[in-house]
Amino acid sequence: GSGIFQLRLQEFVNQRGMLANGQSCEPGCRTFFRICLKHFQATFSEGPCTFGNVSTPVLGTNSFVVRDKNSGSGRNPLQLPFNFTWPGTFSLNIQAWHTPGDDLRPETSPGNSLISQIIIQGSLAVGKIWRTDEQNDTLTRLSYSYRVICSDNYYGESCSRLCKKRDDHFGHYECQPDGSLSCLPGWTGKYCDQPICLSGCHEQNGYCSKPDECICRPGWQGRLCNECIPHNGCRHGTCSIPWQCACDEGWGGLFCDQDLNYCTHHSPCKNGSTCSNSGPKGYTCTCLPGYTGEHCELGLSKCASNPCRNGGSCKDQENSYHCLCPPGYYGQHCEHSTLTCADSPCFNGGSCRERNQGSSYACECPPNFTGSNCEKKVDRCTSNPCANGGQCQNRGPSRTCRCRPGFTGTHCELHISDCARSPCAHGGTCHDLENGPVCTCPAGFSGRRCEVRITHDACASGPCFNGATCYTGLSPNNFVCNCPYGFVGSRCEFPVGLPPSFPWVA
C-alpha cells in the first residue's frame, strides 16, 4: 500500500509569548513545529515515529495564521507519506518550538525550547475530506486539520490496491475509486483485454482484435461471418458448412457445373419441337413435321416431298406450294391428264393402257424407270436404305451399301462387335464403344487390354461411395467408379436424379 497523511496547520496563538517552562521568549517566540506520526497507542510514549515525522521552518512569532504553500520550505499542508496498508488508526504528536537560530532549518539549532505539544489518538479512514480540530492549553491554541489520502495509482479503504490505467494489449481500462478496473468503451474481460466485436459477429466463425471488428475464420464470409464459403469453383451450388458444394436442382458434378436439366435452363429446341434431357449437357430435339436440324431450326421445303406429278415443277409458297403442270396435265398435283394413248405419252419404252373409256391412260414402265410417264430413272438410294452411316451406291439395276467399320449386312444394319474377338485379358469386361472396345479390368490389372498386372490395387482403399463398383485399368489413376442409379461424381459421391451415361473416371 501507499498513501499520505496530510496535516494542515491553520492558526497558532501564543499571545503572551511564553514557553512551556513558564519563561517568556525574547523578543518573541519564533515558532516552528515538529510532527511525529506513529501507530495507535492508548498511551502515547516516546520512541520512533513509526509512520513518519516532519519538521517545519519558522512559521511565525507568537501568534500567527499559517498560509497554504505548495512547494519549497514551509510547505503546508505537511506531507507524511507511508508505504504500507493504512491501518485506520494512528497517534499524532504536534510540538511547537521556539528557536533562537536559523529560520529555515531551526531543527539543527542549539538552544531550542518547547512551547507546547498536543497528542491526538484515534481512528481515521482514508478519504478526501479534512477532519478539523482545535487544541487549547493554558497558554496556547492550535487550529489544524488532517486527512489520509492514497498515493497516485493506489486505491481502496487502506490504499492497498495498486491500479494504473492502461491502454495496451494487456488491458484497456481506467481505475474505479475502489481500485477495480473500469473497461474503456469497446473492451471487456477480467483485464479489459477482450475486444467487443461488431454486434452480431458470429461467436464461433468470427473474431476481432479491436472493438467493432468482425474477422472471419477460414471458410466463412460476410459482414458478420455467418455465410459459409462454398467449394472453390462451385457454380450452381450452395453450402451449409464451408467448402461444401450442394447442387441446386437440375445440376450435378463435383462443382455443380453439369447441367442435368439442359432443356429447362437453355430451351435449345426451336419451332415447337420437344426437348428431352439425356444426361449432363445432353438433350435431343424431336421436330414437328416440316422442320429439321439438331435444334429443329431448319424449316423443310414444302416441295421436299415432290408432290407434283407427271413432270410438274414445284414452287414453294409461304405456307404451301404450287405445281406448274407440263402440257397435257392439270390438277393441284398435275394428277389429271388431257392426253390419251394416241398422244404416245409413255417414255423409255413404257407401254400405254387406256382408262376411263379412252379419256385417260396409265403407263407401264420397264425396269429402272418410274413416274406416271416412265420419265424418271429409278435412284435406288433416295430412300436412304443404308443404316449406321453406310454409303449407298447405284449399281445398274440394283444398289449396294458400303458399310462403316464395325457394321455389316445388306443395309449395314448389323453391328460387328469389337468384343467378339475377346480383346480383354485376365477376365476383363469388354464394352463396345464408338471409338473401339474398352476394357474394365478386375482388381490387380490395368492397361487398355488389362494386360498390365499392378502391384498396388487402387480399389483396395474402397474409393467409391454409395455402393458403386470399383474397376482398375481404365484411367491413369488406375481406378474407375461405376455409379449406381442416382449418383454421379468421380467417386459417385453426389446424388442426382439421373443415371450416369457411363462410369465416371477417377
Partner: antibody, heavy 121, light 107 residues
Amino acid sequence: EVQLQESGPGLVKPSETLSLTCTVSGGSISSSSYYWGWIRQPPGKGLEWIGDIYYTGSTYYNPSLKSRVTISVDTSKNQFSLKLSSVTAADTAVYYCARQALALGGGSDKWGQGTLVTVSS
Amino acid sequence: SYELTQPPSVSVSPGQTASITCSGQRLGDKYASWYQQKPGQSPVLVIYEDSKRPSGIPERFSGSNSGDTATLTISGTQPMDEADYYCQAWDRDTGVFGGGTKLTVLG
C-alpha cells in the same frame, strides 16, 4: 509445467530470412490468459523485445523491427513462429520465446532456453 | 521512442541492501517488471506490477515505482544474487527493456 522450446537454423546468410519456431508443451497456446512473445539478446548486450502474438492471431511488433518481422501462430501444433527478413550481422543474437501473462501485467513468467542465431556468409 | 535507463553496474557487500534504479519519463504511471539473468541462462521474472513477487521468488526482493523512477531493492544480498538485472515496462503496445545493471556481490 509449461515449457517453451525454440528451434531453427543456427546460421543464416545476410539478406536472407531468419525463421524460428517456439513449441509450447504442458499447456495450451490457445489460453486467453497469455500472449506469446519473442525477445532477443545480442552477445554481451541487453534484451530487446521483438513482438508478441495472441492465440487469435493478433500481433504486436517493436516499431524498430516492424517492417521486417512476422509472427504467426499454429494452435493445432501448439507453436508460434518468428520470421525476420533481410537480416544483417546486427541481427546475430540469442533469440528467446516467452509467455507474457495478463495476470502479471504483461510480465514474462516463462522463457525458452534461447537459441543462438548467427548471421554470416 | 520510449527509453528506460539503468546504471551499468552496482556493487554491494553480502548481507547489505542493494538498490537498482530504472528511470523513464512518467515511469510511475506504468507498471514496471524486473528480470534476473545469470550467465548462460534465460531471464527470470523477479518483480511484476512494480512490487509484486511471483511465487518462488525470495522475500528479500522488493520493488517500488513512482514519479520517473522504479527501484528494485534486494535486502540482505547474497552471493547467489550476483547477476544482470533488467527493468521492463510497456509503452502502449511495445515492450521496452532497460539496458541492464550488473550486480556485483563483493567479497
